[in-house]
Interface confidence: low
């Protein structure tokens, strides 16, 4: 339905509060280095303009597209060239090229200071002094650090952030009330950002078809009682929502997400029996709840898949008539029967089925050719099962920290050219799969583990894309979305790598390590481990373990010493010498 003024339409649909919040998120995700005050000024100007359009949709410029209006506003920033360099060239382009140009300059790893949490009393004072500014700052800081954060979901996080401060700043022990909530929001926020980043990468790098296939598989697992036409409708709508958000069209995205939640709740009887509680919640909570809802029970007595997809004489006819619909039905039928499989495994099976039909439907005897297609699935299913079993055994044996270290060594040997901070961040996240997924029964391990690994490996891919240093990473990241994890798993030690020269400075530590949190201290040690492997890629596990044990003892000893700094200087030299000898450096 066409509207005379798109900006007025969205303002009316979303309401002033959400409109302003979403425009702030959009601007902060585009211009990640701009000061908070500059963004607030731009948002206020856009909001005032929107109000004039609500009053009179025929007013001057009200008929312009949102990209034109927002792009024009961003291009008024005086310091654009000195702050952003070549991004300023985007302003010379016309829409839609200008928006595409802004999108290409989004930075997954912006050079921004680490967010340090102030004292609780300081935060509570700031919250009470100016609640609106306090919450806007939260949106701004998250959005600029996570330029693909799912905007309507960020509104939900902001609502919870506000609720935490409202409750805890009145509590007797403010810190005990507030800090766990902020930790939870931070951890959930990082996870939410990473999951959305994969959705955007899927759409932008592999196209709408890839995203739709993912959505068919996931929604069919979640809503196995829904019929194929219903799942297809949900997939189409969900694809539109995520395409909009990933494309920077945050107002349209939030509006369409609300419409989708409304549709799902109005039709929950034909979708899932698990939606009742979600649908009783307010809008932001409702949308979040639906996105996280547990899988419905599988219908009883589902017939064998073989009848329609192998035994039927009409397989090639049905495939030829509407290839994507037929493959979509295959994926739907397979996924609804297999909540125990990861989405990426289901997509690999569908790809194998498609490849087989492409080959066999052109053969002399198609049925004879594809009759054994399901046998080809067995090794595809067993590979992730075995990998998860082996890694969960290793995790249970080592615990999370040492399991992360094993992965650090493994991945540094595979792709030693990747920067140390990226290897540490990605390997630490890969290692979290153990505590996240290994405690669960067989039926829940694979969807938990492999789909989580897809999210983490996508972090590696987007960080590497910014500064490509390894052909092997580029290959695994770009060849196939669903085979990324098997591709990385299959990588062996990079024999072409020339070891890094030894630099004693890398292994020089100071007393400040003693005041770090346990997590930060682990990161310091893991950074040293990566550097060791880069210096000596052929070092054995035993050699590395010995050096790391010595290092841990050295830190512990010096942190207990009266003169810590002297201890670190003197004992550090000894440790470096002993490590060089142990590793033959």
């Amino acid at each position: 339905d066409a509207h005379k003024s798109e900006v007025a339409h969205r303002f009316k649909d979303l309401g002033e509060e959400n409109f302003k919040a979403l425009v702030l998120i959009a601007f902060a995700q585009y211009l990640q280095q701009c000061p908070f005050e500059d963004h607030v000024k731009l948002v206020n100007e856009v909001t005032e303009f929107a109000k004039t359009c609500v009053a009179d949709e025929s007013a001057e410029n009200c008929d312009k597209s949102l990209h034109t209006l927002f792009g024009d506003k961003l291009c008024t920033v005086a310091t654009l060239r000195e702050t952003y360099g070549e991004m300023a060239d985007c302003c010379a382009k016309q829409e839609p090229e200008r928006n595409e140009c802004f999108l290409q300059h989004k930075d997954d790893n912006p050079n921004l200071p680490r967010l340090v949490r102030p004292e609780v009393d300081v935060m509570c004072t700031a919250f009470h002094d100016n609640e609106e500014t306090f919450l806007k700052k939260y949106l701004y800081e998250i959005a600029r650090r996570h330029p693909y954060f799912y905007a309507p979901e960020l509104l939900f996080f902001a609502k919870r952030y506000k609720a935490a401060f409202t409750e805890c700043c009145q509590a007797a022990d403010k810190a005990a009330c507030l800090l766990p909530k902020l930790d939870e929001l931070r951890d959930e926020g990082k996870a939410s950002s990473a999951k959305q980043r994969l959705k955007c990468a899927s759409l932008q790098k592999f196209g709408e078809r890839a995203f739709k296939a993912w959505a068919v598989a996931r929604l069919s697992q979640r809503f196995p009682k829904a019929e194929f036409a219903e799942v297809s409708k949900l997939v189409t709508d969900l694809t539109k929502v995520h395409t909009e958000c990933c494309h920077g069209d945050l107002l349209e995205c939030a509006d369409d997400r609300a419409d989708l939640a409304k549709y799902i709740c109005e039709n929950q009887d034909s979708i899932s029996s698990k939606l009742k509680e979600c649908c009783e919640k307010p809008l932001l909570e409702k949308s979040h709840c639906i996105a996280e809802v547990e899988n419905d029970e599988m219908p009883a007595d589902l017939p064998s898949l073989a009848a329609d997809f192998v035994e039927s004489k009409d397989v090639c006819k049905n495939y030829a008539e509407a290839k994507d619909v037929f493959l979509g039905m295959f994926l739907y039928e397979y996924a609804r029967r297999h909540p125990d499989y990861s989405v990426v495994l289901l997509l690999r099976l569908a790809k194998t089925y498609e490849t087989t039909l492409e080959k066999c439907c052109a053969a002399a005897d198609p049925h004879e050719c594809y009759a054994k297609v399901f046998d080809e699935f067995k090794p595809l299913v067993e590979e992730p099962q075995n990998l998860i079993k082996q890694n969960c055994e290793l995790f249970e044996q080592l615990g999370e920290y040492k399991f992360q270290n094993a992965l650090l060594v493994r991945y540094t040997k595979k792709v030693p050219q990747v920067s140390t901070p990226t290897l540490v961040e990605v390997s630490r996240n890969l290692g979290k799969v153990g505590s996240k997924c290994c405690k669960h029964p067989e039926a829940k391990r694979m969807p938990c583990a492999e789909d989580y690994l897809s999210v983490v490996l996508n972090q590696l891919c987007v960080l590497h894309e910014k500064t490509p240093v390894s052909d092997r990473v580029t290959k695994c990241c770009t060849e196939s979305l669903v085979n990324r994890r098997p591709c990385f798993s299959a990588l062996e030690v990079d024999e072409t790598y020339v070891p890094k020269e030894f630099n004693a400075e890398t292994f020089t530590f100071h007393a400040d390590i003693c005041t770090l949190s346990e997590k930060e201290r682990q990161i310091k040690k893991q950074t040293a481990l990566v550097e060791l492997v880069k210096h000596k890629p052929k070092a054995t596990k035993e050699q590395l373990k010995a050096v790391m044990d010595d290092f841990a003892a050295f830190v512990e000893k010096c942190c207990k010493a009266d003169d810590k700094e002297t201890c670190f200087a003197e004992e550090g030299k000894k440790l470096v010498a002993a490590s060089q000898a142990a590793l033959g450096l």
Epitope: C177, K181, E184, A191, K439, H440, R445, C448
Partner: nanobody, 124 residues
Framework: EVQLVESGGGVVQPGGSLRLSCAAS????????MGWFRQAPGKEREFVAA????????YYADSVKGRFTISRDNSKNTVYLQLNSLRPEDTALYYC?????????????????WGQGTLVTVSS
Amino acid sequence: EVQLVESGGGVVQPGGSLRLSCAASGGTFSTYVMGWFRQAPGKEREFVAAISQNSIHTYYADSVKGRFTISRDNSKNTVYLQLNSLRPEDTALYYCAASRFTSWYTADYEYDYWGQGTLVTVSS
């Protein structure tokens, strides 16, 4: 590493009540979402109830809503499950679980730590 120890299980007649307790040690209890799950003989483990860090949110499986109540006392590092109007189908091993971070309270794979379980038998 968080350790969880359940207690309070036993044999009870249909319509009766029990109160299960789960004592936690080894971690900052108030930073964990706590949940109860159960597993009947020959069946899969299923979600029963969960409670957020500061008791703001509670979640229940449809089958126990109105009969079971989850609560926690952060000062005692303990989570409770009050079971009322018990039915034979409530017979199961009841597990306590802790999750440092969860976006989905009802999914057992979101929980990082598990107790050994306490047996509840409802029989006349």
